[in-house]
Interface confidence: low
């Protein structure tokens, strides 16, 4: 049998058949079903949903569907001892207290088990002190405070606005600045789009709405008590003092009604510039402490949350490949939510469900994919990507030998303006070709391709006539697959217009107001954007699992490697004197990139010409493509971040959500002018250039002719 016959690719069972089977109405129905009650990780409700999904995936026709459970560290508020923040007077009396819960949205007043807003993994504590406003609590914000304004945060409670960077980075920065507590709040400048009403009348954040979220700094470790290994029945667990990534100071989130009460009284220094002002009617004084008559008042935090080892459940579905069953294409997204999960994650989970149904329909008609497809419903993503990481730790040997690609499927929408894709350069051509074949759902682009509307609305900053595709960072379940294991990964969703809406994420992110009605009334009433995202995610999985030659183009990696080398070189060249003094050269890196470019070009030529009917040669060429991403993995990992092992990409050390290129070199150069031992610092830059150059050269050689 030829490969074509084995996978039964007939006109009835091609990509079009798979895509045509995807229905917006089904996604809508699944979203409704997944969002009627909360599905917090570690709760009975989320276990029941796992079993429901297992049962339905079996009905849809998958070969097997199993639950994979782990016992991981989670964090919950104390039900009888709520968390809050108060303003206290000189006598210690609480003259103002923040709210204990969000006012529930209409229709949900009688729903039980809505977890109140909290910062997951905050330690317990009741610190009191003067407040310092630290803007977004980014690295540069603390530089401004400490270096330019000479404001000392030591022993202070800091208040920071959500947005721009991952909240865990904010807490880490505050800890390093010596703060004894952190208050996080949503400023309307970031979470209230002008001209749009608050929920339930629109998609904006009301004053009582609060963003939940974890504040860990795991750096890819997974369960804080079992870094590197699965949290299984015989796991050895670290003591809590040795746990990875836990914050050391109390942290609590509030909405802008409560934030107004705290910020309104702030005295001390004026904000350094307009970028420190939000849109509340307060002066945004930095502090420390309150002004004038209020200078004797202090802020006190009351945090009583507990960390508990709790069982979580992933759902893993398998559709066995007909020709290469030992090659895995994975589609995964999480199931756990903070409350109802109207967008995060169930808009993604509903799309995965429909993709599984469509694949199952084809399978029932006798079709199989060429390669095995694994479908995953991850648990405890919101608590630090725990479900996906533990499963990957348990299955790392299989994955590193057999993993072709991972496609992530969290929230399908964060807006309804245009497509947003982050992926490995290996997938650029796949994404371009696929979106050229899909219809755009956008108004004004009737009859046009998705590629066309996407390129028009989100043009590439480098290449005319092409859409923007971003680097992978982290903050989602692809992390372990890409950053630790080196499996080619990608993600796609519909997003907002970043030019006109400069708020962070979507306003109701991680609040009680993220409901089915939010999506159905305001974001995607026809579910046409969800359908498009299903087509993109599903289409990528279909091609990756079914194309005879893997749809990876190694030449696109060559292009970006040159771009990243130019960028890091120009950063280093801001210090020409030191580069001369310490003999810092990038020649080895540029030489390796040049070699990679030439070898990738020759490999692509061979890929066009080889005999695809020879299964051994086909498998050999495909393996070279599959293992290219793996070749960028350094087994020793990045400095102080052993689970971030990809030499070309890592989550930014200053913002987990963002990707950084040549992260080892970047971090070595960061703030190098302030290092106490410049010789040692520039020595580390040289070492990182060496590691990067070696890795690029080694990766290039995997594409050379094998003998």
């Amino acid at each position: 049998k030829s490969s074509n016959e084995a996978t039964n690719i007939t006109p009835k069972h091609n990509m079009k058949a798979f895509l045509d089977e995807l229905k917006a109405e089904n996604i809508k129905k699944f979203l409704y079903n997944f969002t009627q009650i909360p599905h917090l990780a570690g709760t009975e409700q989320n276990f029941q949903l796992a079993k429901q999904i297992q049962s339905q995936w079996k009905e849809f026709g998958l070969d097997s569907v199993e639950l994979a459970h782990y016992d991981v560290l989670l964090s919950y508020p104390n039900k009888t001892h709520p968390n809050y923040i108060s303003i206290i007077n000189e006598d210690g009396n609480e003259i103002f207290n923040t709210s204990l819960f969000e006012p529930p949205p209409p229709g949900y007043e009688n729903v039980s088990d809505i977890v109140p807003p909290f910062s997951a993994f905050s330690p317990q504590g009741m610190p009191e002190g003067d407040l310092v406003y630290v803007n977004y609590a980014r690295t540069e914000d603390f530089f401004k405070l400490e270096r330019d304004m000479k404001i000392n945060c030591s022993g202070k409670i800091v208040i920071a606005r959500y947005g721009k960077v991952f909240r865990g980075n904010k807490v880490k920065n505050a800890q390093l600045a010596g703060a004894k507590g952190v208050i996080l709040y949503s400023d309307p400048a970031d979470y209230f789009a002008p001209g749009v009403k608050s929920y339930p009348d629109g998609w904006n954040l009301p004053g009582g709405g609060v963003q939940r979220g974890n504040i860990l700094n795991l750096n890819g470790a997974g369960d804080p008590l079992t870094p590197g290994y699965p949290a299984n029945e015989y796991a050895y667990r670290r003591g809590i003092a040795e746990a990875v990534g836990l914050p050391s100071i109390p942290v609590h989130p509030i909405g802008y009604y409560d934030a107004q009460k705290l910020l309104e009284k702030m005295g001390g220094s004026a904000p350094p510039d307009s970028s420190w002002r939000g849109s509340l009617k307060v002066p945004y004084n930095v502090g420390p402490g309150f002004t004038g008559n209020f200078s004797t008042q202090k802020v006190k935090m009351h945090i009583h949350s507990t960390n508990e080892v709790t069982r979580i459940y992933n759902v893993i579905g398998t559709l066995r490949g007909a020709v290469e069953p030992d090659r895995y294409v994975i589609l995964g997204g999480h199931r756990d939510s903070w409350v109802f999960g109207g967008i995060d994650p169930q808009s993604g989970a509903a799309v995965v469900h429909e993709i599984v149904r469509s694949f199952g329909t084809l399978k029932k008609e006798g079709w199989r994919p060429r390669r095995t497809i694994l479908f995953a419903s991850w648990d405890a993503e919101e608590f630090g990507l725990l479900g996906s990481t533990e499963w990957a730790e348990e299955n790392s040997r299989l994955l590193q030998e057999r993993g072709v690609a991972y496609i992530n499927a969290d929230s399908s929408i964060e807006g309804n303006y245009t497509l947003r894709v982050d992926c490995t350069p290996l997938m650029y051509s796949l994404v371009h070709n696929l979106t050229k074949e899909l219809k755009s759902p956008d108004e004004g682009f009737e009859g046009k391709s998705l590629y066309e509307s996407w390129t028009k609305k989100s043009p590439s900053p480098e290449f005319s006539g092409m859409p923007r595709i971003s680097k992978l960072g982290s903050g989602n379940d692809f992390e372990v697959f890409f950053q630790r294991l080196g499996i080619a990964s990608g993600r796609a969703r519909y997003t907002k217009n970043w030019e006109t809406n400069k708020f962070s994420g979507y306003p109701l992110y991680h609040s009680v107001y993220e409901t089915y009605e939010l999506v159905e009334k305001f974001y995607d009433p026809m579910f046409k954007y969800h359908l498009t995202v299903a087509q993109v995610r599903g289409g990528m999985v279909f091609e990756l699992a079914n194309s005879i030659v893997l749809p990876f183009d190694c030449r696109d990696y060559a292009v970006v490697l040159r771009k990243y080398a130019d960028k890091i070189y120009s950063i280093s060249m801001k210090h020409p004197q030191e580069m001369k003094t310490y003999s810092v050269s990038f020649d080895s890196l540029f030489s390796a990139v040049k070699n990679f470019t030439e070898i990738a070009s020759k490999f692509s030529e061979r890929l066009q010409d080889f005999d695809k009917s020879n299964p051994i040669v086909l498998r050999m060429m495909n393996d070279q493509l599959m293992f290219l991403e793996r070749a960028f993995i350094d087994p020793l990992g990045l400095p102080d971040r052993p689970f971030y092992r990809h030499v070309i990409y890592a989550p930014s050390s200053h913002n987990k959500y963002a990707g950084e290129s040549f992260p080892g070199i970047y971090d070595a150069l960061f703030d190098i002018e302030s290092k106490v031992d410049p010789s040692k610092a520039w020595g580390e830059v040289k070492r990182q250039i060496y590691v990067a150059a070696f890795t690029v050269q080694a990766a290039a050689e995997t594409l050379s002719e094998v003998a």
Partner: nanobody
Framework: QVQLVESGGGVVQPGRSLRLSCAAS????????MGWFRQAPGKEREFVGA????????KVSDSVKGRFTISRDNSKNTLYLQMNSLRAEDTAVYFC???????????????????WGQGTQVTVSS
């Protein structure tokens, strides 16, 4: 809905003082900022000053700085403008404004969708 009623206006000689009051009634909970504006004949409405809910933040325009003081008594739901060393150019209709919006360009930002009083006339003349 919030109703604002200004009082205390009148005719006064240059160099003398006057105290304006603005009583707020109705749904006053959640009024975060109150302010004074004035409009002289043939001119645009001009910002005079504002005060935040607790009185901890006050802002007065440069043209009246050092002469006018803004204050607020929350127990009486009343805003005050103490005007000293009055000048002829202070002649105008003085309006009280209140905002329950938490967001704006600045904390003392007001616009037409906020609450406004009818105004009280202040004439400074010898």
């Amino acid at each position: 809905q919030v109703q604002l009623v200004e009082s205390g206006g009148g005719v006064v000689q240059p160099g003398r003082s006057l105290r304006l009051s603005c009583a707020a009634s109705g749904r006053t909970f959640g009024i975060y900022v109150m302010g004074w504006f004035r409009q002289a004949p043939g001119k645009e409405r001009e910002f005079v000053g504002a005060i935040s809910w607790s009185g901890s933040n006050r802002k007065v325009s440069d043209s009246v700085k050092g002469r006018f003081t803004i204050s607020r008594d929350n127990s009486k739901n009343t805003l005050y403008l103490q005007m000293n060393s009055l000048r002829a150019e202070d002649t105008a209709v003085y309006f009280c404004a209140a905002s329950n919006k938490l967001y704006g360009r600045t904390w003392y930002d007001f616009n037409e969708s906020d609450y406004w009083g009818q105004g009280t006339q202040v004439t400074v003349s010898s």
